[in-house]
Each structure stands twice: as structure tokens, then as C-alpha cells.
């Protein structure tokens, strides 16, 4: 019996054939974060809840230390949102002061660390300037793409000021990953 | 013959292969709202087209009364985005008459209903403060995320103001699910 | 030996067993936008990379000339996220100076184009009205959803204005579908 | 049934004051943002003012701004336009309306404002 | 403001005739349309929105089209119901509506 014999004749044949229930999955949410060091000129990394909640991992995707590990090699779907909220930037006072004015900004980046390669490599980033003329302010940045990804390589989520970040509801700020 | 003859040593043998084309999916497009009661204290729910244009339901997703019905245990991918339009607001003005100001916003919540559980779940939410100085405005939230669903939860988006979204096009106000 | 061997009792037995790692995947990235001819009242194609870096295409999914071409008929998910750029809209002083004020916008659009259907089809549009107080803004729209595309289909990303395309990341603005 | 009452109209002296209402029935209210829309005697309809489902954002043509004032109370199922300072061409019937994105989809019967002297 | 241009002002048909009301914007106002008939001594009546789509009970013989600066309300084969007075109305920039087409039997 061939690995191919119900699959479109196009199919390699040494592709092999897997339950998807059995593929490394994980959903995280958000968790107050504490303030940690981290390198300078590298945004903060998130951490996370990752088992209480709508939070989980299954089949050898790991959570540790910030980290999603990948077990295995394949493509991924990887996605994050980050809701952040503050009090309103000045911009447009000193703009109408006719100062320059540089923006406020907010970032969010998902990373790629793989132990091999001195360089982390960044795969997602949404970046929005702030400058709201209300009072208080928040809102989202969403990220989600396929990547191929090898076994070992780690995955975490940086932001621009972590003291930004909503951590108040696990539905408003979450990071996920799955095998496609 | 064992279940994980084609697949990686690391298989469950009693995970099922599944063919893909028969996963539950469905991809809901937006309709007109209309006025309608619903609980005091939820933000309401949007209804749904499902069968004309771009929407579709298959394998036993079905849509009912503003709800997808999960016809399958199993992890799904849910998202869905809307799409606001609105007049600006008056936040700026009040915010220079010195009066304090809370700014209005603008939320979708993706909610999981359960029968067998008293309250509803807020899986995602997109929450974003509006205050805008042009005329009229408009922006889309967009939200999509991995869940753990049982057979026989209920899926909705729920909008802050039924009154600001863009019922206009299929392309901009869209809500699915699919079982990986 | 029937095709249903292993799977769930509600399961088609003529639906194929499909291995993963077989299925059409891309993932673009972008690149510096040459200024081109487009059709008037029809927003411009972007182009994009589709093998340095992070972007790839895999398993007869092919790139070519700011087309993603379809290869199997299915269930794709497709997404993108663009980022834009600019210098402050006017809008705020033009609505001071009590002049007609209609807000400048950014827009994406994913297009689908089919041989033999005359007119292109808008699968995903993100539009928001830009109206900043600050002098330079930066933000992203992301889109993505699920789709029934046939063999043969191609797939564009529109812009409203190419000039306003942040290309310099290949993090920053990207464009992929897969197979589910 | 979604129904919309207007009340309040009446006669009234150049530069006076008065106050509509509008009561809601039939929805959930504080959801449906809301307008002021008015018809002068054999003239044709203009928007006069509008407010979101919470309240907290406001709309005005630029014809009443700083005069009329638009509320909204959820609890009481009711809007509200408070106007000054009124004119003989604010002279119209008001129509309270449910408004869907930018169009308007139910209308209530109309109350009458007369100013004159 | 943007201003609307309906077109005629006033048009008298007979029952079972088409009519076709022509509405301008001043600049354009991409599909952000509507169109509503009014009678006498009543509110208006919300008929078509986006420029083409039809208000749910709306009859089928009303039909709307149009983008950007130009639109048309067209009425297939007039009944006697539909005498009144047709209004469009845009939402992209503010709120404005046209001046009216009265529509009368001939």
C-alpha cells in the first residue's frame, strides 16, 4: 500500500500522511507583566499564560520563559494581537507650536530565535503612530502569517513599551501558533 | 493496518486521518441590520449572510438566528473583521472647552456560547477609541484566533454600536471559522 | 482498503486523504514599488518577492507578475497585511477653516481574477479614513479570511496609493494564501 | 414592533427655547445611534443633528451648532434636542429617526415647531 | 457641505409608466446613497440603499444605480402608491439630502 493511494495523483509520494488532531498547537493569553531587563536597543518580549483560561498548548508546542518552542519542522500560522491603551501624546499641542514634532509610536513584532544564528529574525511587525486628540486611547494591532519554521526555533512577541500593553483580558492581547 | 502507518513515529495511533475537504467551514458575509431587542447590557449581535456571493457554509457548519453551530469537536481557526463608519465625533472640542472627556469606541467581541454553561465566552475581542477630527470617518477591527470548540457551541460577533457598521459590501464586514 | 479507514464515522468516503506538507503555500514579501500603468478606477497591483528572505512558494503555487496563481481547486486561507506611510492629511485644518472636508483614505484590497468571469472579485477590502494631527503617520491594515478558489485562479493586492506603501520590511507588508 | 414618538413641539417667540423628545419602544436602544432631522413648511428635509448608541459622541450641521444641543437618556428609552436661541427659519416639523450607518431607517411621526412672534 | 441635485424637480407620469429621478453629488461620494419616498403629512419611507440595494419590503419595481457623482432612482411600472415625493440622501462626508422630485399623475 502507497502513501498516495487516496490522494489527488499530483501528491509526492513520500509525503507522509498525519492527523491533523495530533498537530503542535498553542493558544496564549495575556498576563500582567513585571518589569524585566532586557537588551538595549531590542523591544521587551511578552510573557504569557499558557494552560488556564482559553489558553493552551498541545502536542509537543511548548511555552517557556517567553518562548513558544517549535518541535517540529513544517509551516506555521502564526498570529498575535496586542491591544495597548494610554494617556493622549502632546502631538498635536506641539505641532500648533510649531516645534517638529516626532510621532508616538506603537509596536508589535514576532520573533524568530533559532540557537544556530547569532541574529534573531523579526517575521511579523505592525507599527502604528499615535498622536489622538481625545483623552484616553487604546487600540489593537493584529499580526498573523505562515512561515516554515524549523524544529528548535523559538518564537516570542516584542513590543515598544511594555507598560502599554492591556493585560486585562485574555480575549484583548493573546499569540498563537499551529502546524498547518 | 495501524493509523500512524503513514505518518511521522511521533502519531497517536488512535488519532483519525481525516480528509481535508470534509472539515466544517464557513465564511459569513455582512447583511443590513435591522433595529431589533436583544439583552440589555450585551452589545448586540450581527446576523449573517451564508449562502450568497463570497459566503458559504459546508460539512455540517451551519448558520442559525445570528449563530454558527461547531457541528465537530476540534481546534478551530475563528476571525472575522468589521468594518465602522461614522461622523466625528465632538471629543476634540469637548476636550478643548477643558470638560473631561471619555472618548467614544468601537469593539467587536467574538463570543462562544455554550448551552450547557450559564455564560457566554469572549474568545476575541478588537476594542478601539475613536476620536476623529476629519468629517466622516471609517476603519476596520480585525480579529482571528485559535480555539478549543465543542460540538454544539454556538459562535457570534458581537458589535459596541450596530449603528456604525458598514453593511455596504461583502469585502469589509466578514465573519468565519474553519477546523484545522 | 476505503478511504474512510481511519477517519470519522460522518466522514464522505470519496473525499481524498491529503498529506500536508504536499499543499500549495506562498508567503510574499514586499518589494520597492516601480511606478506602472493600471487601469483607471481600478487601484494598483502591488508586486512582491516570492523567494529571498521569508517569502516562499511551495507545491505548485506560483508567483508571477503580481499574481498568485492557484493551482488546485479548494479552500485557501488568504491574507495581507500592508503598511502605509505618509505625510499629515490637511483634513483638521481644512475642517477648521470651515472648507469641504472629504477625509483622505488608505485602502487594501484582495483581488480575485478568474479567466473566464470579466470583472475581477473583491474578496477582502480594509479601508480607513486618515485624518492625522501629528506630521508623519505610519499604520497597518491587516486582512485575511477563507475562500473557495478554483484551479486557475489568480490573486492580487490592490492598493489606493502605491506611493503610500511602506516597502522598506519585508515584516511590514506581506501576502500569502494556503490551501486548508 | 419598533415605534418612535416625538413630543415637545409647539409655538414659540423668536430667540426662546424648547425641548424634544423622542421615546423608543420595540429595540434596544442604547445600541442605535440617533437624529434630528427637520422639514421646513413645503420645503424639503434637512439633518439637523445626531448621537451615538452610548451617548458620548455628538453630530451637528453647522445651522444649529452651539445652539441645539442632541442627548440621549438609555434608562428612559428616550432622546432628547434641546434648542435656543430659535429663529423663524428653525420653523419645522421635527422627525426623530434610527440611524444605520449614515441612512435612516425608521421615522418617527413628527412633532410640529412653530417660532414666531 | 456636499451638495445634492435631484433632477427634475417634478415629473407627472401615468400609472404604469417608468420614471427615472436623477440624483447629483457636488463632488464624489463613492456608493454612500439613499433614496426615500415621502407623502404627504407622513415621514419619510427608507427605499434603497449603497446606491443598488433595495430596503427589505421594498417592491422590486424600484431600482437604484450609480457611483461617485451620479445616481438614478428609476420606478419599472408605476401603481398609484407611488405618487409622493422622492428624496436622495448622502452619507459620505456629513449628512445631505437632495431637494426633492415630486412625482404626480398625470
Known amino acids: 500500500l502507497k502513501g498516495q493511494e487516496f490522494a489527488p495523483s499530483h501528491q509526492q509520494v513520500y509525503a507522509p500522511l498525519r492527523a491533523d488532531g495530533d498537530k503542535p498547537r498553542a493558544h496564549l493569553t495575556v498576563v500582567r507583566q513585571t518589569p524585566t531587563q532586557h537588551f538595549k536597543n531590542q523591544f521587551p518580549a511578552l510573557h504569557w499564560e499558557h494552560e488556564l483560561g482559553l489558553a493552551f498548548t498541545k502536542n509537543r508546542m511548548n511555552y517557556t520563559n517567553k518562548f513558544l518552542l517549535i518541535p517540529e519542522s513544517g509551516d506555521y500560522f502564526i498570529y498575535s494581537q496586542v491591544t495597548f491603551r494610554g494617556m493622549t501624546s502632546e502631538c498635536s499641542e506641539i505641532r500648533q507650536a510649531g516645534r517638529p514634532n516626532k510621532p508616538d509610536s506603537i509596536t508589535v513584532v514576532i520573533t524568530k530565535v533559532t540557537d544556530s544564528y547569532p541574529e534573531p529574525t523579526q517575521l511579523l511587525m505592525g507599527t502604528k503612530s499615535v498622536c489622538e486628540v481625545g483623552s484616553n486611547w487604546f487600540q489593537p494591532i493584529y499580526l498573523g502569517a505562515m512561515f516554515s519554521l524549523q524544529e528548535g526555533d523559538k518564537l516570542m512577541v516584542n513590543v515598544s513599551d511594555i507598560s502599554l500593553v492591556d493585560y486585562t483580558k485574555e480575549d484583548k492581547t493573546f499569540f498563537g501558533a499551529f502546524l498547518l | 493496518l495501524k493509523g500512524q502507518e503513514f505518518a511521522p513515529s511521533h502519531q497517536q495511533v488512535y488519532a483519525p486521518l481525516r480528509a481535508d475537504g470534509d472539515k466544517p467551514r464557513a465564511h459569513l458575509t455582512v447583511v443590513r441590520q435591522t433595529p431589533t431587542q436583544h439583552f440589555k447590557n450585551q452589545f448586540p449581535a450581527l446576523h449573517w449572510e451564508h449562502e450568497l456571493g463570497l459566503a458559504f457554509t459546508k460539512n455540517r457548519m451551519n448558520y442559525t438566528n445570528k449563530f454558527l453551530l461547531i457541528p465537530e469537536s476540534g481546534d478551530y481557526f475563528i476571525y472575522s473583521q468589521v468594518t465602522f463608519r461614522g461622523m466625528t465625533s465632538e471629543c476634540s472640542e469637548i476636550r478643548q472647552a477643558g470638560r473631561p472627556n471619555k472618548p467614544d469606541s468601537i469593539t467587536v467581541v467574538i463570543t462562544k456560547v455554550t448551552d450547557s454553561y450559564p455564560e457566554p465566552t469572549q474568545l476575541l475581542m478588537g476594542t478601539k477609541s475613536v476620536c476623529e477630527v476629519g468629517s466622516n470617518w471609517f476603519q476596520p477591527i480585525y480579529l482571528g484566533a485559535m480555539f478549543s470548540l465543542q460540538e454544539g457551541d454556538k459562535l457570534m460577533v458581537n458589535v459596541s454600536d450596530i449603528s456604525l457598521v458598514d453593511y455596504t459590501k461583502e469585502d469589509k464586514t466578514f465573519f468565519g471559522a474553519f477546523l484545522l | 482498503l476505503k478511504g474512510q479507514e481511519f477517519a470519522p464515522s460522518h466522514q464522505q468516503v470519496y473525499a481524498p486523504l491529503r498529506a500536508d506538507g504536499d499543499k500549495p503555500r506562498a508567503h510574499l514579501t514586499v518589494v520597492r514599488q516601480t511606478p506602472t500603468q493600471h487601469f483607471k478606477n481600478q487601484f494598483p497591483a502591488l508586486h512582491w518577492e516570492h523567494e529571498l528572505g521569508l517569502a516562499f512558494t511551495k507545491n505548485r503555487m506560483n508567483y508571477t507578475n503580481k499574481f498568485l496563481l492557484i493551482p488546485e481547486s479548494g479552500d485557501y486561507f488568504i491574507y495581507s497585511q500592508v503598511t502605509f506611510r505618509g505625510m499629515t492629511s490637511e483634513c483638521s485644518e481644512i475642517r477648521q477653516a470651515g472648507r469641504p472636508n472629504k477625509p483622505d483614505s488608505i485602502t487594501v484590497v484582495i483581488t480575485k481574477v478568474t479567466d473566464s468571469y470579466p470583472e475581477p472579485t473583491q474578496l477582502l477590502m480594509g479601508t480607513k479614513s486618515v485624518c492625522e494631527v501629528g506630521s508623519n503617520w505610519f499604520q497597518p491594515i491587516y486582512l485575511g479570511a477563507m475562500f473557495s478558489l478554483q484551479e486557475g485562479d489568480k490573486l492580487m493586492v490592490n492598493v489606493s496609493d502605491i506611493s503610500l506603501v511602506d516597502y522598506t520590511k519585508e515584516d511590514k507588508t506581506f501576502f500569502g494564501a494556503f490551501l486548508l | 414592533e419598533v415605534h418612535l414618538l416625538e413630543s415637545g413641539g409647539g409655538l414659540v417667540q423668536p430667540g426662546g427655547s424648547l425641548r424634544l423628545s423622542c421615546a423608543a419602544s420595540?429595540?434596544?436602544?442604547?445600541?442605535?445611534?440617533m437624529s434630528w432631522v427637520r422639514q421646513a413648511p413645503g420645503k424639503g428635509l434637512e439633518w439637523v443633528s445626531g448621537?451615538?448608541?452610548?451617548?458620548?459622541?455628538?453630530y451637528y450641521a453647522d445651522s444649529v451648532k452651539g445652539r441645539f444641543t442632541i442627548s440621549r437618556d438609555n434608562s428612559k428609552n428616550t432622546l432628547y434636542l434641546q434648542m435656543n436661541s430659535l429663529r423663524a427659519e428653525n420653523t419645522a416639523v421635527y422627525y426623530c429617526?434610527?440611524?444605520?450607518?449614515?441612512?435612516?431607517?425608521?421615522w418617527g411621526q413628527g412633532t410640529m415647531v412653530t417660532v414666531s412672534s | 457641505d456636499i451638495q445634492m441635485i435631484q433632477s427634475p424637480s417634478s415629473l407627472s407620469a401615468s400609472v404604469g409608466d417608468s420614471v427615472t429621478i436623477t440624483c447629483r453629488a457636488s463632488?464624489?461620494?463613492?456608493?454612500?446613497l439613499n433614496w426615500y419616498q415621502q407623502k404627504p403629512g407622513k415621514a419619510p419611507k427608507f427605499l434603497i440603499y449603497?446606491?443598488?440595494s433595495l430596503q427589505s419590503g421594498v417592491p422590486s419595481r424600484f431600482s437604484g444605480s450609480g457611483s461617485g457623482t451620479d445616481f438614478t432612482l428609476t420606478i419599472s411600472s408605476l401603481q398609484p402608491e407611488d405618487f409622493a415625493t422622492y428624496y436622495c440622501?448622502?452619507?459620505?462626508?456629513?449628512?445631505?439630502f437632495g431637494q426633492g422630485t415630486r412625482l404626480e399623475i398625470k
Open positions: 429617526a434610527i440611524e444605520m450607518a449614515g441612512a435612516f431607517d425608521i
Open positions: 420595540g429595540f434596544t436602544f442604547s445600541s442605535y445611534a
Open positions: 448621537i451615538s448608541g452610548g451617548g458620548g459622541s455628538t
Open positions: 463632488q464624489s461620494i463613492s456608493y454612500y
Open positions: 449603497a446606491a443598488s
Open positions: 440622501q448622502q452619507s459620505y462626508s456629513s449628512i445631505t
